[in-house]
Amino acid sequence: TQHGIRLPLRSGLGGAPLGLRLPRETDEEPEEPGRRGSFVEMVDNLRGKSGQGYYVEMTVGSPPQTLNILVDTGSSNFAVGAAPHPFLHRYYQRQLSSTYRDLRKGVYVPYTQGKWEGELGTDLVSIPHGPNVTVRANIAAITESDKFFINGSNWEGILGLAYAEIARPDDSLEPFFDSLVKQTHVPNLFSLQLCGAGFPLNQSEVLASVGGSMIIGGIDHSLYTGSLWYTPIRREWYYEVIIVRVEINGQDLKMDCKEYNYDKSIVDSGTTNLRLPKKVFEAAVKSIKAASSTEKFPDGFWLGEQLVCWQAGTTPWNIFPVISLYLMGEVTNQSFRITILPQQYLRPVEDVATSQDDCYKFAISQSSTGTVMGAVIMEGFYVVFDRARKRIGFAVSACHVHDEFRTAAVEGPFVTLDMEDCGYNIPQTDESTLMTGRA
C-alpha cells in the first residue's frame, strides 16, 4: 500500500554516500594524550546495518584467521563460530592455531532471542583496522547455536564490549576490552559511529558500503559535529545510564522517571531497536500515533510486525515526530537531551513484492528488561564509551540520516532535579537469571 504525500528525500546529507565525512574544526585541548584527534586507520572499519548488526574484521590465532565480528556493547563475551553452520561462510578452527589454549570449560549464553554454547579458551587476537597490537584474549568457541547467527549478515562471531559482571559463565572471565587495556597502552575508551543507510541495502551493497567506525582508544573529531555531552555510567555491568525525561515532538510524556529506567536503561549496539518498558512504550506509541494521525497505520505496524511502504522518495517524514531522551548529566541537577528523527526509528527494509517502494518497520518495541538504546538510537550519534571516566558521551553523528528540515540533536544543559531518583534498584537475584537482551 502507498501512504500519503510525496516528499522527495535523500537530497540533503541523508543521500550522501556513506563514506562521506564532514570535517570538523575544534579548539578543544586533548584531555589525555592519545585520547582525541585523528584515528584514520580506524575510521570506516565497520560494516553492516542496524537490522543485522555492525561488524569489525578481527584476526584470531596463529597463523591469523580472519573473521567478521559483531560489535556488541550489550554483552561481555568474545565468542566466535567454531564449527560448521549453514549461515557461516567461515569459522574459527582451533586445531589450526598454534597459540590456542583450551580452558577446559564450557559456556552457555541465552539471549532474549537465540542462544549459543561453546568451549572456552584463549588465543592471540588483533583488529587489522584497529590499534596495532595483539592480545591474548578469552574466546568462546561456539559449537552449538539456535537463532543466533543470521543468514546473510556476514559476521561469524560477537565482540561483547560490556563489563565482566555480565560475562558468562561468570565474572571471572575477563572480557576482550579489559584484556586489551591491561596488556597494551590503549586507553580505556572506545567510540562508535554506526551509520544507518536510510534505505535498504542488499547483500552486495552491505559488503561494499561503509557501516561506520569503531575507534579503539580514542575519539575522532571527524565523526561528529557540535559538542560531546556525557552521561554517567550508573553501574559497570551493561553500559547502564539514567533517562530523566522523554519527549515526543517536545511534549513531555510526564511519567515518573523511574518508569523510563525500569528495570534499567542500557546502550546496546547489538540490539536493533529502541526498546522501552511496557508502560513507556504504550505512552510513547500513543503520542507518536497522535502526532502522525494524518495517516492511519495498521496495529501490526506499531508492533513492529508489519511494513508500511510509500512510493519511492515520498516517505512523509514530516508527519512523524522527533523523540527526545533526556539523560542525566555529569553535573548535579543538569541533564542534556538526545533527539532522534523518524529516519532513525523507521527502519528501512526491502519489500520483495514492491521493490520500487520505500518500506519501513517501526523500530521501537516493548521490553520487559528495561530501556535498550539500540542501533536505531546509536545511528543518530557518535557515542563515546569512556570507561576510564565511567561515562558515555553523545554527539550528533556526521553520518546520520536526516532531511533538509530536521536533524538529530544533542543539546543542553537543562535543569533537572532529583535525577538520582530516576534510577531503579534491581533486587539482588541469582546471576544465573540474567538474560542478555536482543531484539
Partner: antibody, heavy 124, light 107 residues
Framework: EVQLLESGGGLVQPGGSLRLSCAAS????????MSWVRQAPGKGLEWVSA????????YYADSVKGRFTISRDNSKNTLYLQMNSLRAEDTAVYYC?????????????????WGQGTLVTVSS | EIVLTQSPATLSLSPGERATLSCRAS??????LAWYQQKPGQAPRLLIY???NRATGIPARFSGSGSGTDFTLTISSLEPEDFAVYYC?????????FGGGTKVEIK
C-alpha cells in the same frame, strides 16, 4: 515415557573393539544432549563422554580420549559409543543418559534418566 | 581436573533422622553441581541440580545448598527408601567428575 536401552556390551580381549548402542524412545531425540557414564564393578561413577543434540559438540574424559568415539544418528534415535584399544580398566557397566536439553552447559541441563546399563568386560 | 571429595564415606543413621552429606571441590565449580542417588542394581537418578534445585518428582525432604567449593545435600528425615549411595558431580570444567560417593546405611 522416556526409555533408554543400551546394547553391545560383552567380553572382549585387551586391544579389541566394541560398539555400544543406546536406543532412545519417548522423547524427541535430536532435541537432547546425551552422555555415557560408566561404573567399574563395586566402584563409583565415571563420566566417559557427551554429545550435543545436533552432534556438533563431543567431549571425552581424558582416560578415553583418542580411543572412544561418541556419535548419534538422530534419524534412528540412537546413541553410539565406539570403543577401540580397550584395556582391562575399561571394564564397567556403561550407562547412557539423556540430557535436560539440546545444550550441554545450560543451567538445569543435567543427565536424567539413565538406561539400565550394559556390561563391558575386557579380559584375556 | 577438578576433584570432588565426598564425606563421610559412610553414614549410619536410623529412619527419621537427618542426613547431611558433604561434597568439596578442589576448585570453584560455581553452581554447576548435582547430586544423584543410586540404589543397588539400579541406574543413578537425579536428585538435585545446579546445587540447590530439586529435580522433578523428588520429595521435599531432599535439599541442596552451597556454591563455589562447598556443597551439602540434606535429607531432613530419612525414609526407608532413602538408604542408598549418593554421588555429587560437577560440569563446570572438563572432564566432568563425580565424587567417590557417600553410602547412607541403616544403623
Amino acid at each position: 515415557e522416556v526409555q533408554l536401552l543400551e546394547s553391545g556390551g560383552g567380553l572382549v580381549q585387551p586391544g579389541g573393539s566394541l560398539r555400544l548402542s543406546c536406543a532412545a524412545s519417548g522423547f524427541t531425540f535430536s532435541s537432547y544432549a546425551m552422555s555415557w557414564v560408566r561404573q567399574a564393578p563395586g566402584k563409583g561413577l565415571e563420566w566417559v563422554s557427551a554429545i550435543s543434540g545436533s552432534g556438533g559438540s563431543t567431549y571425552y574424559a581424558d582416560s578415553v580420549k583418542g580411543r572412544f568415539t561418541i556419535s548419534r544418528d538422530n534419524s534412528k534415535n540412537t546413541l553410539y559409543l565406539q570403543m577401540n584399544s580397550l584395556r582391562a580398566e575399561d571394564t564397567a557397566v556403561y550407562y547412557c543418559a539423556k540430557g535436560g536439553s539440546q545444550w550441554l552447559y545450560a543451567p538445569g541441563s543435567w543427565f536424567d534418566p539413565w538406561g539400565q546399563g550394559t556390561l563391558v568386560t575386557v579380559s584375556s | 581436573e577438578i576433584v570432588l571429595t565426598q564425606s563421610p564415606a559412610t553414614l549410619s543413621l536410623s529412619p527419621g533422622e537427618r542426613a547431611t552429606l558433604s561434597c568439596r571441590a578442589s576448585q570453584s565449580v560455581s553452581s554447576y553441581l548435582a547430586w544423584y542417588q543410586q540404589k543397588p542394581g539400579q541406574a543413578p537418578r537425579l536428585l538435585i541440580y545446579d546445587a540447590s534445585n530439586r529435580a522433578t518428582g523428588i520429595p521435599a525432604r531432599f535439599s541442596g545448598s552451597g556454591s563455589g567449593t562447598d556443597f551439602t545435600l540434606t535429607i531432613s528425615s530419612l525414609e526407608p527408601e532413602d538408604f542408598a549411595v549418593y554421588y555429587c558431580v560437577q560440569r563446570s570444567n572438563f572432564p566432568w567428575t563425580f565424587g567417590g560417593g557417600t553410602k547412607v546405611e541403616i544403623k
